[in-house]
């Protein structure tokens, strides 16, 4: 598991100190008050597929 202060979670996810895990930022849609959602607000979601430019 990732420790705080080491490499960040991959794009589209954010570190949860409560759970000690990288959590999918998609969770913040329904549960915006989760501890990791603050980190999600600063980063754009991961694109699932390439969009036409």
């Amino acid at each position: 598991e990732q420790a705080p202060g080491t490499a960040p979670c991959s794009r589209g996810s954010s570190w949860s100190a409560d759970l000690d895990k990288c959590m999918d930022c998609a969770s913040c849609r329904a549960r915006p008050h989760s501890d990791f959602c603050l980190g999600c607000a600063a980063a754009p979601p991961a694109p699932f597929r390439l969009l036409w430019p």
Epitope: C9, S10, G12, S13, S16, D18, L19, K21, C22, M23, D24, C25, A26, S27, R29, A30, R31, H33, S34, D35, P45, A46, P47, F48
Partner: antibody
Amino acid sequence: QVQLQQWGAGLLKPSETLSLTCAVYGGSFSGYYWSWIRQPPGKGLEWIGEINHRGSTNSNPSLKSRDTISVDTSKNQFSLRLRSVTAADTAVYYCAREGISGSMGIYDYSGMDVWGQGTTVTVSS
Amino acid sequence: DIVMTQSPDSLAVSLGERATINCKSRQSILYSSNNKNYLTWYQQKPGQPPKLLIYWASTRESGVPDRFSGSGSGTDFTLTISSLQAEDVAVYYCQQYYSTPYTFGQGTKLEIK
């Protein structure tokens, strides 16, 4: 292994307040969301609401703000209060944990994986 | 609210045969940023709490027999039991947790023919 044990009054009169508590044993309390669900006799499931250890809640608007979900982190417990009950609130009430699962190192909520035993609540005059 | 509709309401299948239960959501529960459908399937036997079978529409919960599988995306989902066993007699519910309030289908009662 996480276990949920729930308790509360089983027989209420109309206009009284339903009060149920669910205790979490054998696992982490922090970070998870803890839910209440009910099931009227012979009918389907209805989600009431959820809370995390920080006290952040989501509730079902169908209850018209009659419900209060609270948490006591010192005891690893969470509770449901439902005011002004009527016969329509007669149901089996369950507490449950919203589980977390991972894929490629990224975790997400993944459904209610641990449930309490259920408490039958009857509202009758 | 996202309305979930299951079909059929009840189903009778012979032992060893395939059982298929459908679930339709009134709006998409596919989250485009991670291509994940926020849909679960539960099994409930009389006098017991529901048991989680499938999450993210198609991922089997740990300990669930591999005869249970989930499929579908967007608004249309299916739970399949490939070879019905006597212990599979139960009511099955789908549930969306894409947005609050999280909502369940009305349930499908599965019996042995």
